[in-house]
Amino acid sequence: APVRSLNCTLRDSQQKSLVMSGPYELKALHLQGQDMEQQVVFSMSFVQGEESNDKIPVALGLKEKNLYLSCVLKDDKPTLQLESVDPKNYPKKKMEKRFVFNKIEINNKLEFESAQFPNWYISTSQAENMPVFLGGTKGGQDITDFTMQFVSS
C-alpha cells in the first residue's frame, strides 16, 4: 500500500515559520503577510517505526522536492540536514532510520525526536533568522515545541 502523507507547515512555539536557507538548510523567522508564501511546506509521511498513542513515526519531506530532513553524525555530533533522494523511491513505508522522527504530541504542541538519535530534537533558536538544527536539550534556550498547520494538496 502507498505510504500515507499529508501536507503541512510548522511553526515553533514563538510563532516563527520555517523557510529555506541555502539549498540544504532551513531557518526560522517571523513572517507576515505575503512573506508567508516563503515558508516551507512539508509532506509528512507516516512511516514504519515504534508507535504509541502520543508518539508517531514520520518522515518530513519538502513538498514537490526530493529533499528530506535527515539526522546524521557529523564530527561525532548528531546533525540535522536536508538530504536529496531519488524521487522514484521516496516516500516509502520503510524509511531509513535517519529520515524518521518520532512526532510526539504534548499539550497540543508537537516535538520531533530523531529516531536515529533518541533525545535529540528538531530545534530552533530564540533568535531571528537562525538555522533549524538538531538539539540535545529540552526546556532550555532552544525551542523544541511546534504547531502544525494543514495545507490542502
Epitope: 531557518k27 530545534s123 533558536s125 533568535a127 531571528e128 537562525m130 538555522p131 538538531l134 534556550q141 532552544d142
Partner: antibody, heavy 118, light 107 residues
C-alpha cells in the same frame, strides 16, 4: 556596557595549534549566538564560525572545516576557538562578535593576532 | 555560497560630500544585509542591519536601502570621522559572506 576581549593569539608554526578565548561581559552571554570572524593583514573580513546559545549548533567556513572547533562555556561567559593544523593562510586578526538581530555582528572584540610562520 | 560584490573598491571624497556605496548579492537575500565601518587598527562597527535599520547610536547621516540583490549605503554630508573602509555582509544563509570593502579616502 557590552565588552568582548579576545586572547590566545601569537606566533605558531605551520601544523601547530592555538586556542583563542573571548571573555564576554555586560550582557547575558548565554542568550546570544556568537561568531568568530577573521581579517588577514591588509585584507577584508572573513566569517569563520558560529555557535548557538546552548552550543547545540555550530557552523564553519569551508576554509577551516575539520581543523577549527568553536565552543563556549556559559558558566564562564567565554567563547573559544580551537585551531589545529594551522596554515600560513590562517594568519589574521581574529575577532569574536556577538550576533545581533537576524545575523549581523552588533558588538566586536578588539581582535587577537594569529601569525602562522616557520 | 552567496557572493557579495561591493563597488567602488575605493573612492576619494571631501567633507560635506554625499557618498553612495553599492553592494550586490549573487542571489536574493531578501533584506538580510548589514553594513559595517572599520577604521585602521580597530574592529568593525555595525552601522545598518536588515538593509535599512540604523543601529542604535549611529548618526542619521548614514542610511541603507535595497532588498533582494541590490543594496546601497548612503552617507549624507561626509564628516572627517567617516573616512574609513565599509563592508556589507549577507545574513541570509551560512556561510555568511562579506563584500570586499570600499575604502573612502580624503580627496
Amino acid at each position: 556596557e557590552v565588552q568582548l576581549l579576545e586572547s590566545g593569539g601569537g606566533l605558531v608554526q605551520p601544523g601547530g595549534s592555538l586556542r583563542l578565548s573571548c571573555a564576554a561581559s555586560g550582557f547575558t552571554f548565554s542568550k546570544y549566538w556568537m561568531f568568530w570572524v577573521r581579517q588577514a593583514p591588509g585584507k577584508g573580513l572573513e566569517w569563520v564560525s558560529v555557535i548557538s546559545p546552548s552550543g547545540g549548533m555550530t557552523r564553519y567556513a569551508d576554509s577551516v572545516k575539520g581543523r577549527f572547533t568553536i565552543s563556549r562555556d556559559n558558566s564562564k561567559n567565554t567563547l573559544y576557538l580551537q585551531m589545529n593544523s594551522l596554515r600560513a593562510e590562517d594568519t589574521a586578526v581574529y575577532y569574536c562578535a556577538r550576533v545581533g538581530y537576524g545575523g549581523n555582528s552588533d558588538y566586536w572584540g578588539q581582535g587577537t593576532l594569529v601569525t602562522v610562520s616557520s | 555560497d552567496i557572493q557579495m560584490t561591493q563597488s567602488p573598491s575605493s573612492v576619494s571624497a571631501s567633507v560635506g560630500d554625499r557618498l553612495t556605496i553599492i553592494c550586490r548579492a549573487s542571489q536574493d537575500i531578501n533584506r538580510w544585509l548589514a553594513w559595517y565601518q572599520q577604521t585602521p587598527g580597530n574592529a568593525p562597527k555595525l552601522l545598518i542591519h536588515s538593509a535599512t535599520s540604523l543601529q542604535s547610536g549611529v548618526p542619521s547621516r548614514f542610511s541603507g536601502s535595497g532588498s533582494g540583490t541590490d543594496f546601497t549605503l548612503t552617507i549624507n554630508s561626509l564628516q572627517p570621522e567617516d573616512f574609513a573602509t565599509y563592508y556589507c555582509q549577507q545574513a541570509d544563509s551560512f556561510p555568511l559572506t562579506f563584500g570586499g570593502g570600499t575604502k573612502v579616502e580624503i580627496k
